[in-house]
């Protein structure tokens, strides 16, 4: 405890020597001085610290809030904090998941590219031409037009991106 | 020798502000955690607020928060107390002390007094 | 809140051991500490962490106990010691006091 000028990466400068820092999952209650040691003592429950620190409060674990459509992912531990995600067909709007958003459905004419996760929304494209989607959805992809000539079929009517081609008898020739 | 030296204390009409200074020689400023402490006229001792080593963190009394607010400038070596929107049951002797868990040093205390 | 207990005066002869009692409302581990506060002048702190005494208080003070129940000892009492004792509990915030205890000597 001695006299220093650059102290360890675990401890700190306080008043001209070098204390120990506290270790994660603990606080600080007392400054080291020439005589003691830092006096640490652990987290209280449903606080942590993550760091070597010298902080005389822990943080206090997040609470994942219901009604923002938040549940726990992980629980806090006196070294970490409640890991929060959203609830089933949503998704996080932030890197730190504060808050939610339904997932968005690709509209007729649109077909998933990309599924929603927890974290991330839909991605839609546009249906190419030669493929249709007619419905809202999370996870249909736009789906080729059917071939009426692989059936021996001819096209009434034809598809567009929301509609598949309506096949139909070749008619005779007369 | 370690003094902490609140000012600036006095009467001040309920709703209106106050902003206590409070000057600490003696020892390293940046290297505390600080707080204000009061006490009601004839009455016991009551934490008000808290600050963190660079003011980044700070705590306070569910009764003053939204209305008081801590500071400090650790080039000046000084601990500050923005009281808004006073009530009467605001007036107490200030205490301005050097924090850790405990209250190590402490002041000599200013007085305010909220009243019309 | 935790709110700490403390009888609200005593009264003792000089020479005599007295002890001054705080009690929590939750367990505070050892996160209890003592000052003195004389008439008229700022809290003194004499004893940290439950029992640590404080750089300067006479030897005459000492503290003890854990979780909800405390103690501070004064032995012997000296007329200087005329004052009121306040514990404080810093397990959690807001950091909070007891009343304090009013010490008066015969």
């Known amino acids: 405890l001695g006299q220093c000028v650059t102290c360890s990466d675990k401890q700190y400068l306080h008043d001209g020597q070098c204390c120990d820092l506290c270790q994660p999952g603990s606080r600080l209650t007392s400054h080291c001085t020439a005589l003691e040691k830092t006096q640490c003592h652990p987290c209280d429950s449903g606080e942590f610290s993550a760091q070597w620190n010298r902080e005389i409060r822990c943080h206090q674990h997040r609470h994942c809030e219901p009604n923002q459509g938040l549940r726990v992912k992980k629980e806090g531990t006196a070294e970490s904090d409640t890991v929060c995600t959203c609830k089933e067909g949503q998704h996080c709007t932030s890197k730190d998941c504060e808050a939610c958003a339904q997932h968005t459905p690709c509209i007729p004419g649109f077909g998933v590219m990309e599924m929603a996760t927890e974290t991330t929304d839909t991605v839609c494209h546009p249906c190419p031409v030669g493929f249709f989607s007619n419905q809202s959805s999370l996870f249909e992809k736009c789906y080729p037009w059917t071939s009426c000539e692989d059936k021996n079929l001819e096209v009434l009517q034809k598809g567009t991106s929301q509609t598949n081609v309506i096949c139909g008898l070749k008619s005779r020739m007369r | 020798e370690v003094q902490v030296v609140e000012s600036d204390g006095g009467l001040v009409q309920p709703g209106r502000s106050l902003k206590l200074p409070c000057a600490a020689s003696?020892?390293?400023?940046?290297?505390?955690?600080m707080a204000w402490v009061r006490q009601a006229p004839t009455k016991g001792l009551e934490w008000v607020a808290s600050?963190?080593?660079?003011?980044?963190?700070?705590y306070y009394r569910d009764s003053v928060k939204g209305r008081f607010t801590i500071s400090r400038d650790n080039a000046k070596s000084t601990l500050y107390l923005q009281m808004d929107s006073l009530r009467s049951e605001d007036t107490a002797t200030y205490y301005c002390?050097?924090?850790?868990?405990?209250?190590?040093?402490w002041g000599q205390g200013v007085m305010v007094t909220v009243s019309s | 809140d935790i709110e700490l207990t403390q009888s609200p005066a005593l009264a003792v002869s000089p020479g005599e051991r007295v002890t001054i009692s705080c009690r929590a409302s939750?367990?505070?581990?050892?996160?209890m500490h003592w000052y003195q506060q004389k008439p008229g002048q700022q809290p003194k702190l004499l004893i940290y962490?439950?029992?640590h005494l404080e750089s300067g208080v006479p030897a005459r003070f000492s503290g003890s106990g854990s979780g909800t129940d405390f103690t501070l000892t004064i032995d012997p009492v000296e007329a200087d010691d005329t004052a009121t004792y306040y514990c404080?509990?810093?397990?959690?915030?807001?950091?909070?006091f007891g009343g304090g205890t009013k010490l008066e000597l015969k």
């Open positions: 002390g050097r924090h850790s868990s405990y209250f190590d040093y």
């Open positions: 003696g020892f390293t400023f940046s290297d505390y955690y």
């Open positions: 600050i963190s080593y660079d003011g980044s963190s700070t």
């Open positions: 939750d367990s505070v581990s050892t996160l």
């Open positions: 962490l439950a029992s």
């Open positions: 404080q509990q810093s397990w959690n915030d807001p950091w909070t």
